[in-house]
């Protein structure tokens, strides 16, 4: 079974541009999590979904960040407008 699939693997953008990250969770998993990791702040949980419903988005209080999960097999994390301090590794994870 394929693991969690994210795209793009790398993204370079100019400040102020919109960035959209995509995630396909493991089939049959009903919880999906978006994390951000930086050297300065460590690993931060941004938002998680259960059965496609956002449960806790308190890790992204800036309304530049928005996440959606329109169905059980797809989620997006959007940053609009992006800022230099958004530079990080963004992880998607899923679980039963």
């Amino acid at each position: 079974d394929a693991g969690v699939i994210q795209s793009p693997r790398h993204e370079v953008t100019e400040m102020g541009q919109e960035v959209t990250l995509r995630c396909k969770p493991i089939s049959g998993h009903n919880s999906l999590f978006w994390y951000r990791q930086t050297m300065m702040r460590g690993l931060e949980l941004l938002i998680y979904f259960n059965n496609n419903v956002p449960i806790d988005d308190s890790g992204m209080p800036e309304d530049r960040f928005s996440a959606k999960m329109p169905n059980a097999s797809f989620s997006t994390l959007k940053i609009q407008p992006s800022e230099p301090r958004d530079s990080a590794v963004y992880f998607c994870a899923s679980s039963l």
Partner: antibody, heavy 117, light 106 residues
């Protein structure tokens, strides 16, 4: 009914410290981000700090970084603000507020901090 | 930091008047949020995501705008509406407030 009750304010000398508390009830505290906001006498609102539900994401007003520390204890349904090296300009009513509707949907009644010699 | 400037800072009006308060951001924001505060009381959320009324807020309040300029409108002032109003942005930390608009009885 959502309730937020601040405590810990009082009179403190310049250079001193205080720890404010915010006791939450009427909602699942561990599911919500929380803010501190302050209001100096006769002045407007000033955002102070934010902490996410699991304490992983924390933000501070630039002018307060290094002196103020936000924290929470989800087992006690309580939010804290540790304030060190207090100055006269920190004199204000300090409010805690719940993050909801993308904003601050519930506020406490406030606790007064006075920094004076 | 994104500076929010409200205008006017003071506004005198009468019961039944239509009033508009403007909030201008030094940098573009995605949404604006509005609060009402009465003397000696905590602020109360009025409008979120620019135009959505918070639960229990009367329909005479409305919000609109985009980019750098947003407005709060009260269609017909009631006695209980005389208070100070603040806008706030959450697009980028720090989450700044406007300086406030004090609405007084004429």
């Amino acid at each position: 009914e959502v309730q937020l009750v601040e405590s810990g304010g009082g009179l403190v000398q310049p250079g001193g410290s205080l720890r404010l508390s915010c006791a939450a009830s009427g909602f699942t505290f561990s599911n919500f981000g929380m803010h501190w906001v302050r209001q100096a006498p006769g002045k407007g609102l000033e955002w102070v700090s934010y902490i996410s539900s699991g304490s992983q994401t924390i933000y501070y007003a630039d002018t307060l970084k290094g002196r103020f520390t936000i924290s929470r204890d989800n087992s006690k349904n309580t939010l804290y603000l540790q304030m060190n090296s207090l100055r006269a300009e920190d004199t204000a009513v300090y409010y805690c507020a719940r993050r909801g509707e993308g904003a601050m949907d519930y506020w406490g009644q406030g606790t007064t901090v006075t920094v004076s010699s | 930091d994104n500076q929010l400037t409200q205008s006017p800072s003071f506004l005198s009006a009468s019961v039944g008047d239509r009033v508009t308060i403007t909030c201008r951001a030094s940098s573009s924001v995605n949404y604006i949020y509005w609060y009402q505060q009465k003397p000696g009381k905590a602020p109360k959320l009025l409008i979120y995501y620019t135009s959505n009324l918070a639960p229990g807020v009367p329909s005479r309040f409305s919000g609109s705008g985009s980019g750098n300029e947003y407005t709060l409108t009260i269609s017909s002032l009631q006695p209980e509406d005389f208070a100070t109003y603040y806008c706030q942005q959450f697009t980028s930390s720090p989450f700044t407030f406007g300086q406030g608009t004090k609405l007084e009885i004429k």
